[in-house]
């Protein structure tokens, strides 16, 4: 559970995260397990520890081995292990299985290929993408943030895709590559203008002052996996994150469900400790995809608590 395999290529950057859960404020000590030697934290070292992260800048084949991270909270010390393997660069174009990240599959309607592990690095767009060592060119290929989008996917698009990016550490640049297989599913799906199932348009939701309230925005977008579909909440026409009221939060991540084969998403708006001023706000459930945007508005009204007579 707390041992994680990581791999990289010599002369590239490799960053590994300790597989233990902790807070940013916790101290994390790293050791090379075979010698029990502490990993330095000074950035002038080629291999150094930086909190939850262990950085090889760049990696060498001799760095391969098991590294121990000890996460020290005020109450406990927890141990995790990173099993690191650094491979020599291949002279030919073949990417061996042991360098491959998990396979992803796509379809005509949805063809996102995420660049693995990129969130650990300090990189700037654009990413470079290769298929079978050839740089991808043409309008069908779009590098967007940390993923590649392929338009009008065909079965011939299946294969091994490599992303390449530059990690920057204190002004020094290091190359990183990561490869994963992409398979193409034949999917008879379709996309519709969003249909909001809940809430009803101009719904009035009764809430109790001082209590917590949840509003669910639920919409369906068609059949099969959908490309660029989202549901979200707005307050008085403003994104929740920009509104600046910590009591009112969107649930992290959107739940995806398939009801009757339809692809649906829902987003829960949680209001903690409902206040009088919350009743004055306009709550908009927004559903959008490539076809357009649909909006349903909800308002809150005060629910009078039932008197309990003892």
């Amino acid at each position: 559970k707390f041992s994680k395999q990581s791999w990289g290529l010599e002369n590239e950057a490799l960053i590994v995260r300790c597989p233990r859960q902790g807070k940013p404020s916790y101290t994390v000590d790293w050791y090379y397990s075979q010698t029990n030697k502490s990993i330095p934290t000074q950035e002038r070292n080629r291999v150094f520890a930086s909190g939850q992260l262990l950085k090889f800048l760049p990696a060498a084949v001799a760095d391969s081995g098991i590294y121990t991270c000890i996460v020290r909270s005020p109450t406990f010390n927890r141990t995790g292990y990173a099993n690191v393997t650094i491979y020599k660069k291949q002279s030919d174009c073949n990417v061996p299985d042991y360098l491959m990240y998990s396979t992803v599959s796509g379809s005509e309607k949805n063809s996102k290929i995420y660049c693995p592990t990129i969130d650990l690095y300090n990189w700037t767009a654009p990413l470079e993408w290769f298929k079978n060592c050839q740089a991808l060119q043409g309008s069908r290929y779009r590098a967007h943030k940390s993923f590649l989008v392929i338009d009008n996917v065909m079965t011939e698009d299946a294969g091994d895709y490599t992303c390449k990016f530059i990690h920057n550490e204190n002004g020094a640049n290091y190359s990183v590559t990561a490869t994963r297989s992409f398979t193409v599913k034949d999917e008879q799906g379709f996309s519709l203008f969003p249909v909001i199932g809940a809430p009803a348009q101009n719904e009035i939701k009764e809430v109790e002052i001082g209590k917590n309230a949840n509003l669910t925005c639920s919409a369906c977008f068609g059949k099969g996996t959908q490309f660029l579909a989202a549901v979200l909440w707005q307050l008085n026409g403003t994104k929740i994150t920009d509104f600046g009221e910590p009591r009112i939060q969107q649930e992290e991540g959107q739940n995806q469900s398939f009801s009757n084969g339809l692809a649906c998403l829902d987003m829960v708006l949680r209001i903690a400790d409902v206040k009088e001023e919350d009743l004055l706000l306009q709550y908009d459930c927004l559903a959008l995809n490539l076809h357009g945007l649909r909006r349903h508005t909800v308002r809150l009204s005060r629910k009078n608590p039932i008197d309990h007579h003892s």
Partner: antibody, heavy 117, light 106 residues
């Protein structure tokens, strides 16, 4: 020495809500996680959930998702557990306990909540 | 959701005897299990943390073993002060306590 101070007892009516407090001394609650645990009379321990007081992130056991709300006020070094729509099933001792993500080490003495009309 | 089955529910032993309590989980949790002691009218006390690590100040007659799904907690040479309820806690997936074992003296 780390101490967690909880009120001794609460008597509440069915259907009402109650907010329990837990104040830490000799320890900054921001530095770790606060867990809440329920123990019904003559029964075992049930984990309610945990909160990271530094950022307010919470995680609840599925059973308590709609029953409990955990909050924290770092300025007063106090964690809170609010229980809503109380029934006799909620009659129990509620413990706060400090620990990391995985377990609890320091415990309060518990607040006894009695739901009765 | 990871569930924990603890046995026995209660046991009675003479002073000096060995006590064995078992917890079984429905999923492989490596060694992420903790053991608590609770005496009447008191909050629980952590005796052993994950990886079979004895907490500071806990007597060495307490120990635990196990990995994966099967875990055992042992008291060697039980003393009268060990009369209490004992709980295992898994924290691989959320946190779940075992149902508890009541230890009494004959």
């Amino acid at each position: 020495e780390v101490q967690l101070q909880q009120s001794v007892a609460e008597l509440v009516r069915p259907g009402a809500s109650v907010k329990l407090s837990c104040t830490a001394s000799a320890f900054n609650i921001k530095d770790d996680y606060m867990h809440w645990v329920k123990q019904r009379p003559e029964q075992g321990l049930e984990w309610i959930g945990r909160i990271d007081p530094a950022i307010g992130n919470t995680e609840y056991a599925p059973k308590f998702q709609d029953k409990a709300t955990m909050t924290a006020d770092t300025s007063s070094n106090t964690a809170y557990l609010q229980l809503s729509s109380l029934t006799s099933e909620d009659t129990a001792v509620y413990y706060c306990a400090l620990g990391d993500f995985y377990a609890m080490d320091y415990w309060g003495q518990g607040t006894s909540v009695t739901v009765s009309s | 959701e990871t569930t924990v089955t603890q046995s026995p529910a209660s046991l009675s032993v003479a002073t000096g005897e060995k006590v064995t309590i078992r917890c079984i989980t429905n999923t492989d949790i490596d060694d992420v299990i903790h053991w608590y002691q609770q005496k009447p009218g008191e909050p629980p006390k952590l005796l052993i943390s994950e990886g079979n690590t004895l907490r500071p100040g806990v007597p060495s007659r307490f120990s635990s073993s196990g990995y994966g799904t099967d875990f055992v907690f042992t008291i060697e040479n039980t003393l009268s002060e060990d009369v209490a309820d004992y709980y295992c806690l898994q924290s691989d997936n959320m946190l779940t306590f075992g149902a508890g074992t009541k230890l009494e003296l004959k």
